[in-house]
C-alpha cells in the first residue's frame, strides 16, 4: 500500500464512538506468555472492540484472558450493546459533546474540560491521562468553541497545528476535531506524540491527525501516551480508519486532508442496539 492509497481509505457509516472500557485489563494486548502449551482462550481486542480467540501458552500472560467468549463479553463489553451513530443535519453539536466525562483507565490525573450536557456548559474534570472519550479538552476555550452554543450558533475554529520540537513533526495542539471531519477511532489517536520520561531511543510510530498519516518518532522507553505503535501497520490499523468526511445524509467522500475554517451544523442521534 502506498501512502497515497492510505489517504483514500473509505469506511462504512457504522464506526463506533471512542471506547469506554469496563475494566482496565480489557485494554491489555493478548499475551500468550512464555510457556509452550496450546490452549484456546479469548481476549478483548480494543481495536475491533470484540472478544477474539488467541492461543495461550499456559503460564503467565495477563488478565485479558478468558476461558470462554461469554466470560470475555461479560467482563469487557458494556451491556453487550453496540452504539451506532446516525447523522442528520439539524442540531449543532458533535456527538461526543453528549458523552459523559470519562477519566479513562490511567492514574496520571490531570485537569481537563468536558461539556456537561446537564448544565449545558463546559466544566473541568479529573482525567487519568489515557483512553476516555473525545469529550475531553485541554482548554476551556476549546471546549466552548466545539460544544457550547455560541451567540451565532455553532462555531468551529480552524484546526490549530504546531511544530513539535521533540521530533520536528506536525502534531495537533489539542483534541479539537475539524469541522467537516469526524473521528470515531480511539481518542488517543488525536494526542500528540509523547517521548515519555526515560532515556532510550526506540523507533515507534504515532498517528498524526493533522496530516492523517502515521509518522515515526523516538520513544524513550517509558511513560508517554497510547498514541504509540511498534509498526506503521499497527498504527494505521488502529487510527487511520477513524477519520471520515461526511456529506449531507451521512454519505462519504474520498478526501485529501486539506482543511479550511468552516462552519457546520451536524446533529447526532445515539441508538443503542442490543446484541441478539
Amino acid at each position: 500500500d502506498s501512502e497515497e492509497d492510505e489517504e483514500h481509505t473509505i469506511i462504512t457509516d457504522t464506526e463506533l464512538p471512542p471506547l469506554k472500557l469496563m475494566h482496565s485489563f480489557c485494554a491489555f494486548k493478548a499475551d500468550d506468555g512464555p510457556c509452550k502449551a496450546i490452549m484456546k482462550r479469548f481476549f478483548f481486542n480494543i481495536f475491533t472492540r470484540q472478544c477474539e480467540e488467541f492461543i495461550y501458552g499456559g503460564c503467565e500472560g495477563n488478565q485479558n484472558r478468558f476461558e470462554s467468549l461469554e466470560e470475555c463479553k461479560k467482563m469487557c463489553t458494556r451491556d453487550n450493546a453496540n452504539r451506532i451513530i446516525k447523522t442528520t443535519l439539524q442540531q449543532e453539536k458533535p456527538d461526543f459533546c453528549f458523552l459523559e466525562e470519562d477519566p479513562g483507565i490511567c492514574r496520571g490525573y490531570i485537569t481537563r474540560y468536558f461539556y456537561n450536557n446537564q448544565t449545558k456548559q463546559c466544566e473541568r474534570f479529573k482525567y487519568g491521562g489515557c483512553l476516555g472519550n473525545m469529550n475531553n479538552f485541554e482548554t476551556l476555550e476549546e471546549c466552548k468553541n466545539i460544544c457550547e452554543d455560541g451567540p451565532n450558533g455553532f462555531q468551529v475554529d480552524n484546526y490549530g497545528t504546531q511544530l513539535n520540537a521533540v521530533n520536528n513533526s506536525l502534531t495537533p495542539q489539542s483534541t479539537k476535531v475539524p469541522s467537516l471531519f469526524e473521528f470515531h477511532g480511539p481518542s488517543w489517536c488525536l494526542t500528540p506524540a509523547d517521548r515519555g520520561l526515560c532515556r532510550a531511543n526506540e523507533n515507534r510510530f504515532y498517528y498524526n491527525s493533522v496530516i492523517g498519516k502515521c509518522r515515526p518518532f523516538k520513544y524513550s522507553g517509558c511513560g508517554g501516551n497510547e498514541n504509540n505503535f511498534t509498526s506503521k501497520q499497527e498504527c494505521l490499523r488502529a487510527c487511520k480508519k477513524g477519520f471520515i468526511q461526511r456529506i449531507s445524509k451521512g454519505g462519504l467522500i474520498k478526501t485529501k486532508r486539506k482543511r479550511k475554517k468552516q462552519r457546520v451544523k451536524i446533529a447526532y442521534e445515539e441508538i443503542f442496539v442490543k446484541n441478539m
Epitope: Y109, N116, R124
Partner: antibody, heavy 119, light 108 residues
Framework: EVQLVQSGAELKKPGASVKLSCKAS????????MHWVRQTPGQGLEWIGE????????NYNEKFKTRATLTADKSTSTAYMELSSLRSEDTAVYYC????????????WGQGTTVTVSS | EIVLTQSPATLSLSPGERATLSCSAS???????LYWYQQKPGQAPRLWIS???ILASGVPARFSGSGSGTKYTLTISSLEPEDFAVYFC?????????FGQGTKLEIK
Amino acid sequence: EVQLVQSGAELKKPGASVKLSCKASGYTFTSYWMHWVRQTPGQGLEWIGEIKPDQGRINYNEKFKTRATLTADKSTSTAYMELSSLRSEDTAVYYCARSSVVDVAMDYWGQGTTVTVSS
Amino acid sequence: EIVLTQSPATLSLSPGERATLSCSASSSVSSSYLYWYQQKPGQAPRLWISGTSILASGVPARFSGSGSGTKYTLTISSLEPEDFAVYFCHQWSHYPFTFGQGTKLEIK
C-alpha cells in the same frame, strides 16, 4: 452575600471519627464545587477533596481517599466532610472553600473548624 | 503529585522595599493553573492571584505575578504594612491539587 459557615471546634480521641459541616448561602449551592482543605503547622495547606452537589461528583486526594467522605445536602445547602480513624497528625484547622466549575479559584472560604485529636 | 517548593521560607523586609517570592514546581505546570493565596493570622486564605498573573478583585497593582513551566514568582514592587502575611502558591493542573509550604513575609 456569599457565606460559608462551618461547625464548631472538635476534640476527638485517636481512632474516632469526626463529621464537619459547611453551610453555604448567598449563591446557588449546586453550581459550584466545594473543596475541603486542612492546615497543619507542619504540613501547611493540604487539599482533601472536592464535591459538586448537583451530580454528586467527588474527587479525593488519594492520601485521604480511604478515610475521608465528602457529602452534600442540597436541601439545606450544606456540605459535609467526615474523617475516620483519626490520629494525632490530623490535628488541624479544616476549611471548606468554593470554586467555580471551570477553575479552582477558591474565592470564598469558611472560617475554619479546629479539630484536635488527643488521647 | 506535584510538589510546590516556596523560597524563602521567611522574608524579612521593610515597608517600601521590593519583595520577590518564588514558587518552584517538581513538574511543569501550565501558567493558567498556578494561583497565589494570601493568609493573615487567624484568617482563612484569600485568593490573591490567578492564572500566574491575574490579580484578584481588590488586590493592589503593586502586586504582580510571572513565570512558566516550573518557576513562578510573586513580586511586590513597594511593600505596604498590610502586605505582611503568608503567601501560598497553588496548582490545580494535576491531581491532587497542591499548595506550597508558604513564604512568610515579615517586617524587618
